[in-house]
Every structure is written in structure tokens, then in C-alpha cells.
């Protein structure tokens, strides 16, 4: 029951925590900055992995894309490709979790198939839960350092003049979502690998029988298999009591030359 | 790289009007606004009027009334439309351009090459 619950709980908080993954990929707040000297109105700059925004006090709201993929910072780049391994691999851990829940019966898989599976979700999930973690805070660590923008410098550029304005990039919400998110993606991870060694079966214990002989007509065969000429109804040679057999559960035994424990 | 373009300038009698024209191109991120400055001869370069992309605009005191900016978004477009123009308008009109570029490479304010306008008899 223990196992069943740790194993659920796991597939849930994976759950929840590969959706924050995948919101914080898709959100726009990935860094904030706040202009309060413009001479117009209120105007607030975020971005995020995909796009930039502008949104004035006024509620108007514009974003565009990236213009070009080889133009963007290797940093940016990274971010993008382990935000989505992230994702990726906590997709398909989600798909092998479901098949491995304890509480789904899927036709006679054995203990030990959903223990595998419910082990490499679990992995699936540590590993996606890390690569989101590791993404938000690359891009954190890019706008601490703030490399881009340590001076306000002018020159003259294309066509006319250009000056860089001394700016500051804050942590919007999807860094907070995405190490949220991460964090439960991870313990949802470690939660299925719990889960796994309360899943996989013990080493099969047969309780220790004793044989009595019942009468002389009766033929015991080393190891307690009935003989059979592969013709007959025991082809797979399932271990026979007959009725001189007693567990020990059951009855008091002696030791004889027939007893095979 | 981001070109601004001007166009519309040129000489017009006291009391004319002029129509000035600037776009904007090439890797146009977010546009917080756009306007308009001038720089008479022997004078400090001032703002004339600028406009944000949803429309809100500031003039330069004196100029409200005489002066209307406006945008077209999808063109990445400003213009100023100038009238009953007097000779203190002389000045060399520059179109002014502040992007935002974030992660990519900050804010930045971008400047037109100019474009002159003679008010004169």
C-alpha cells in the first residue's frame, strides 16, 4: 500500500512539476526590466526564450520573436536546448509511469516490469527535473553578470547615431516557475525510485515441505517433481503435493531418509 | 543592425506645412517608443514629440497643437506632421528610435541621420 501511494505521489508531483517545466519554457517573464525615466508613459521590457515584450501602463501589449536563430547568444541557445531535453525526457518518463503505476493493470505484466519502468521514470524525471534547474539558472547567472550592459556607450552606427542605455535586467517569474517546477520534477524522480525497490520481488521463498509416505503405492521423484513422460498434464512440471504432503505450518514433522526441504 | 530612414524635409514658406517620415529597419526587437528631436543652428538638439506603440504621445510644450505625431506599428513607421510652420522651426529633424533588445544586447536609442527643414520667405 506504502509502495503504491510513494509511487503515485511521485507520478503526481512529476506531473505537476514537467508542467511548471514546460509553462516556464512557453512564459515571456524570463527577465524584467523596468523603464522609469521615459519622458511618455510607463513602459515595461520583458523577455523571454522565444520573444521579446513590451507591455505601457496604458495595457498595451506588443511582443515579436527572435529575428534569427544563429544571431542569438550560445547562452540563449543552451538554455532553449536544456529547457526542452527537459521536457522531452519528462514526457516520455510520464508515458512509461503511467504503464508502471502499480494501480493500472496492464494485462499480465509482472511486479518486476513495472518495477523497471517505474525506475527508469523515476530517472527520466531526475534527470528532466536537473536540466530544468540547470537551464533557469544559467539564464539567472547571464542576467547577474549582466555582461551586455555595463557601460552606456554611444557611436555612430547605420544610417545614424546609437546609444546604449545603461539598463538592468531583473529575475522574472519563469526562473521562480522554472526552479519551482525542477525541484518537483526532481523529487517526483527520487520519489519513483523509492517506489521501485518496495516494487521489485523478493527472492520467491517456498515454505519448507515436509513428505510423509501415504502409502507404497506412492513414487517420489528427487526435488518433488511427479514424473512425467512430457505427454501428460504436467508438461511444465509444476511442483505436485499429494495428499502425504504437509507444510510445516501444518504438521509436527520427523526427519525420515524421504524428507526434501 | 537597425537603419532609420528619413524622408519629408525640405523648404516651405511661413505658415506651410511639412510632413516628415521615418521607418525603421532591419532586427526591430521591442519598440518602446519613437519621435522625433531638432537641433537649430547653434543650438542643443531638444525633443519635439515622441510616441509610444500604444498610441501615448508627449510634445514639447509650445509645439502641442501645431505639431501631431503619430505611428503605424505594423510598418515600424513615425511621422510628424508639421503646421503653420515659422522660421524658429528651422532645424535639422532627427528621428529617434528607442528598442529594447533585452537579453539580446540591452536598450538602445537609435538616431536618424537627420533631416532638414527651412521655414523661410
Known amino acids: 500500500m506504502a509502495v503504491t501511494a510513494c509511487q503515485g505521489l511521485g507520478f503526481v508531483v512529476s506531473l505537476i512539476g514537467i508542467a511548471g517545466i514546460i509553462a516556464a519554457t512557453c512564459m515571456d517573464q524570463w527577465s524584467t526590466q523596468d523603464l522609469y525615466n521615459n519622458p511618455v508613459t510607463a513602459v515595461f521590457n520583458y523577455q523571454g526564450l522565444w520573444r521579446s515584450c513590451v507591455r505601457e501602463s496604458s495595457g498595451f501589449t506588443e511582443c515579436r520573436g527572435y529575428f534569427t536563430l544563429l544571431g542569438l547568444p550560445a547562452m540563449l541557445q543552451a538554455v532553449r536546448a536544456l529547457m526542452i531535453v527537459g521536457i522531452v525526457l519528462g514526457a516520455i518518463g510520464l508515458l512509461v509511469s503511467i504503464f508502471a503505476l502499480k494501480c493500472i493493470r496492464i494485462g499480465s505484466m509482472e511486479d518486476s516490469a513495472k518495477a523497471n519502468m517505474t525506475l527508469t521514470s523515476g530517472i527520466m524525471f531526475i534527470v528532466s527535473g536537473l536540466c530544468a534547474i540547470a537551464g533557469v539558472s544559467v539564464f539567472a547567472n547571464m542576467l547577474v553578470t549582466n555582461f551586455w550592459m555595463s557601460t552606456a556607450n554611444m557611436y555612430t552606427g547605420m544610417g545614424g547615431m546609437v546609444q546604449t542605455v545603461q539598463t538592468r535586467y531583473t529575475f522574472g517569474a519563469a526562473l521562480f516557475v522554472g526552479w519551482v517546477a525542477g525541484g518537483l520534477t526532481l523529487i517526483g524522480g527520487v520519489m519513483m525510485c523509492i517506489a521501485c525497490r518496495g516494487l521489485a520481488p523478493e527472492e520467491t521463498n517456498y515454505k519448507a515441505v515436509s513428505y510423509h509416505a501415504s502409502g507404497h503405492s506412492v513414487a517420489y521423484k528427487p526435488g518433488g517433481f511427479k514424473a512425467s513422460t512430457g505427454f501428460g498434464s504436467n508438461t511444465k512440471n509444476k511442483k505436485i503435493y499429494d495428499g502425504g504432503a504437509r507444510t510445516e505450518d501444518e504438521v509436527q514433522s520427523y526427519p525420515s531418509k524421504h524428507d526434501y526441504v | 543592425e537597425v537603419q532609420l530612414v528619413e524622408s519629408g524635409g525640405g523648404l516651405v514658406q511661413p505658415g506651410g506645412s511639412l510632413r516628415l517620415s521615418c521607418a525603421a529597419s532591419?532586427?526591430?526587437?521591442?519598440?518602446?517608443?519613437m519621435g522625433w528631436y531638432r537641433q537649430a543652428p547653434g543650438k542643443e538638439r531638444e525633443l519635439v514629440a515622441t510616441?509610444?506603440?500604444?498610441?501615448?504621445?508627449n510634445y514639447q510644450g509650445n509645439l502641442k497643437g501645431r505639431f501631431i505625431i503619430s505611428g503605424d506599428n505594423t510598418k515600424d513607421t513615425v511621422y510628424l506632421q508639421m503646421n503653420n510652420l515659422q522660421p524658429e522651426d528651422t532645424a535639422v529633424y532627427y528621428c529617434?528610435?528607442?528598442?529594447?533588445?533585452?537579453?539580446?544586447?540591452?536598450?538602445?536609442?537609435?538616431w536618424g541621420q537627420g533631416t532638414q527643414v527651412t521655414v523661410s520667405s
Open positions: 532591419g532586427n526591430i526587437l521591442s519598440i518602446n517608443y
Open positions: 510616441i509610444t506603440r500604444g498610441g501615448s504621445t
Open positions: 529617434y528610435f528607442r528598442i529594447n533588445f533585452g537579453i539580446l544586447g540591452g536598450l538602445r536609442d537609435y
